[in-house]
C-alpha cells in the first residue's frame, strides 16, 4: 500500500511540477522592470524567453517576439534549451510513469517491468527538474549581473544635457514558478525512485521458511531457493513465501535487478 501511495504521489507531484515548468517557460515575466526608485511608471517593461512586453499606463499591453535566433544572447539560448529539455524529459517521464503505476493494469505486465519503468520515469523527472532549476538559475544569475552593471552605469551622459536611463530588470514571477516547479519535479522523481525499490525488493527481503517433508529434511535458506536437497527427489528450485498475509505491494513475482544505462 505504501509503495502504491509513494508512486502515486510521486506521479502527481511530478505532474504538477512539469505543468509548472511548461507554464514558466511560456510566461512573459522572466524579468520585470525594477520599480525600486519609481513604483509608479508610465511604461512597464517585462521580458520572457520568447518575447518582451510593455504594459502602458493607458492599460494597453504590447509584446514583441524575438524574431531572431542568431542575434539572441547565448545564455538566453541556453536557458531556452534547458527548459525545453526539461519539458521533453518530463513529458516522456509522465508517459512512462502512467504505464508504470501499480493501480493501472496493462495486460500481463510483470511487476519487474513496472519497477523498471518507475525507475526510468523517476530518473527522467529528476533530470527534468534539474534542467528547469538550472535554466532558471542561469537566467537569474544573468539578471543579477546585468542589474549591477546597469546600476553602475545608471546614467550615461550624452553631451551633458541628455541622459539615457537604462531600464533595470529584476526577478519576474516566472523565475519563482520555475524554481518551485523544478523542485516539485525533482521531489516527484525521487519519490518514484523510492517507490521502485519497494516494487521489486531484493532477495534478502524474503523471510526464511522451514519446510518439513515426511522422512526427509529439506532446508530452505533465506534466499528463497533450495540450497540443499539432501537426498530428496524434488530437484526443482522453488520459491517459498511464508503463509502470512501480505499486501499486494509486498507480494512480488520475481526479484529483479534494475540496470539503467
Amino acid at each position: 500500500m505504501a509503495v502504491t501511495a509513494c508512486q502515486g504521489l510521486g506521479f502527481v507531484v511530478s505532474l504538477i511540477g512539469i505543468a509548472g515548468i511548461i507554464a514558466a517557460t511560456c510566461m512573459d515575466q522572466w524579468s520585470t522592470q525594477d520599480l525600486y526608485n519609481n513604483p509608479v511608471t508610465a511604461v512597464f517593461n517585462y521580458q520572457g524567453l520568447w518575447r518582451s512586453c510593455v504594459r502602458e499606463s493607458s492599460g494597453f499591453t504590447e509584446c514583441r517576439g524575438y524574431f531572431t535566433l542568431l542575434g539572441l544572447p547565448a545564455m538566453l539560448q541556453a536557458v531556452r534549451a534547458l527548459m525545453i529539455v526539461g519539458i521533453v524529459l518530463g513529458a516522456i517521464g509522465l508517459l512512462v510513469s502512467i504505464f508504470a503505476l501499480k493501480c493501472i493494469r496493462i495486460g500481463s505486465m510483470e511487476d519487474s517491468a513496472k519497477a523498471n519503468m518507475t525507475l526510468t520515469s523517476g530518473i527522467m523527472f529528476i533530470v527534468s527538474g534539474l534542467c528547469a532549476i538550472a535554466g532558471v538559475s542561469v537566467f537569474a544569475n544573468m539578471l543579477v549581473t546585468n542589474f549591477w552593471m546597469s546600476t553602475a552605469n545608471m546614467y550615461t551622459g550624452m553631451g551633458g544635457m541628455v541622459q539615457t536611463v537604462q531600464t533595470r530588470y529584476t526577478f519576474g514571477a516566472a523565475l519563482f514558478v520555475g524554481w518551485v516547479a523544478g523542485g516539485l519535479t525533482l521531489i516527484g522523481g525521487v519519490m518514484m525512485c523510492i517507490a521502485c525499490r519497494g516494487l521489486a525488493p531484493e532477495e534478502t527481503n524474503y523471510k526464511a521458511v522451514s519446510y518439513h517433508a515426511s522422512g526427509h529434511s529439506v532446508a530452505y535458506k533465506p534466499g528463497g531457493f533450495k540450497a540443499s536437497t539432501g537426498f530428496g527427489s524434488n530437484t526443482k528450485n522453488k520459491k517459498i513465501y511464508d503463509g502470512g498475509a501480505r499486501t499486494e505491494d509486498e507480494v512480488q513475482s520475481y526479484p529483479s535487478k534494475h540496470d539503467y544505462v
Epitope: 511608471t41 517593461n45 512586453c53 502602458e56 514583441r64
Partner: antibody, heavy 118, light 113 residues
Framework: QVQLVQSGAEVKKPGASVKVSCKAS????????VNWVRQAPGQGLEWIGM????????RLNQQFKDKATLTVDKSTSTAYMELSSLRSEDTAVYYC???????????WGQGTLVTVSS | DIVMTQSPDSLAVSLGERATINCLSS????????????LTWYQQKPGQPPKLLIY???TRDSGVPDRFTGSGSGVDFTLTISSVQAEDVAVYYC?????????FGQGTKLEIK
C-alpha cells in the same frame, strides 16, 4: 462617436474652489484613463494628472498634488477635477482627454476656461 | 521630470513646401520591452483643443493625412509635413508618454509665408 463634453466657463475669486466636469460618451468609460491638461493663456500644455474610472485610481503630477483632486462618477460616465485654493496663476483652459495607445491623448474635451480674479 | 525641447519656436513656410519640426528629449523615450518610442505629436489650432497626429513617434492616428510623418528614436524626434497646406497653420506640440509626469514641448508655431 467618442465625445468628451466639459462644463462651462467659470469665474472664481482667489482662495475659492472650482469643480470642472467632463462627461464621456461613445465608448466604454471604465476602460480608459481620463487625463486633465491645462493651458494658461498664450502658453503651452501642462499635464495635471489622470484618473481611471473603474477603480478611481489616480496618477497626479507632483506639481498639482495640493491643487487638483480627480474623481469619477461611473453611473453618469463623468470625470471631475476639483481645483482648490485658486490663485490668479490658475487662470487657464482646462482640458480632459482620453488616453490611448502609446500614452497618447486621442480625444479631447472642448476645454473649460477658469478665470481667477478678485 | 523629462524635459521636452522643441525647435524652432516658430516656422514660416510657403504652401506646398516641406516643414520640419524637431523635438529633443532629456531622456530616452525608447521602451526596451517593445522597442517603441513613447513620443506623441499634437496639432492645436487657435481656439481648439489639441488634436492627436502621431503616437509611438511614427504611427499616424486614424484620419491624419499622410503628409504628416513622424520619425526619430531615443531622444531625437522629427515631425515632417511634406507639403504644407493652408489648414496646417497651427501650433505643434511633442509629448513624452514614457514616464510620469507626462511633459510637453513648448510648442512650434507654423505659419504660411
Amino acid at each position: 462617436q467618442v465625445q468628451l463634453v466639459q462644463s462651462g466657463a467659470e469665474v472664481k475669486k482667489p482662495g475659492a474652489s472650482v469643480k470642472v466636469s467632463c462627461k464621456a460618451s461613445g465608448y466604454s468609460f471604465t476602460n480608459y484613463w481620463v487625463n486633465w491638461v491645462r493651458q494658461a493663456p498664450g502658453q503651452g500644455l501642462e499635464w495635471i494628472g489622470m484618473v481611471h474610472p473603474s477603480g478611481s485610481e489616480t496618477r497626479l503630477n507632483q506639481q498639482f498634488k495640493d491643487k487638483a483632486t480627480l474623481t469619477v462618477d461611473k453611473s453618469t460616465s463623468t470625470a471631475y477635477m476639483e481645483l482648490s485654493s485658486l490663485r490668479s496663476e490658475d487662470t487657464a483652459v482646462y482640458y480632459c482627454a482620453r488616453v490611448w495607445s502609446g500614452n497618447a491623448f486621442d480625444y479631447w474635451g472642448q476645454g473649460t476656461l477658469v478665470t481667477v480674479s478678485s | 521630470d523629462i524635459v521636452m525641447t522643441q525647435s524652432p519656436d516658430s516656422l514660416a513656410v510657403s504652401l506646398g513646401e516641406r516643414a520640419t519640426i524637431n523635438c529633443l528629449s532629456s531622456q530616452s523615450l525608447l521602451a526596451s520591452g517593445n522597442q517603441r518610442n513613447y513620443l506623441t505629436w499634437y496639432q492645436q489650432k487657435p481656439g481648439q483643443p489639441p488634436k492627436l497626429l502621431i503616437y509611438w513617434a511614427s504611427t499616424r492616428d486614424s484620419g491624419v493625412p499622410d503628409r504628416f510623418t513622424g520619425s526619430g528614436s531615443g531622444v531625437d524626434f522629427t515631425l515632417t509635413i511634406s507639403s504644407v497646406q493652408a489648414e496646417d497653420v497651427a501650433v505643434y506640440y511633442c509629448q513624452n508618454g514614457f514616464s510620469f509626469p507626462f511633459t510637453f514641448g513648448q510648442g512650434t508655431k507654423l505659419e504660411i509665408k
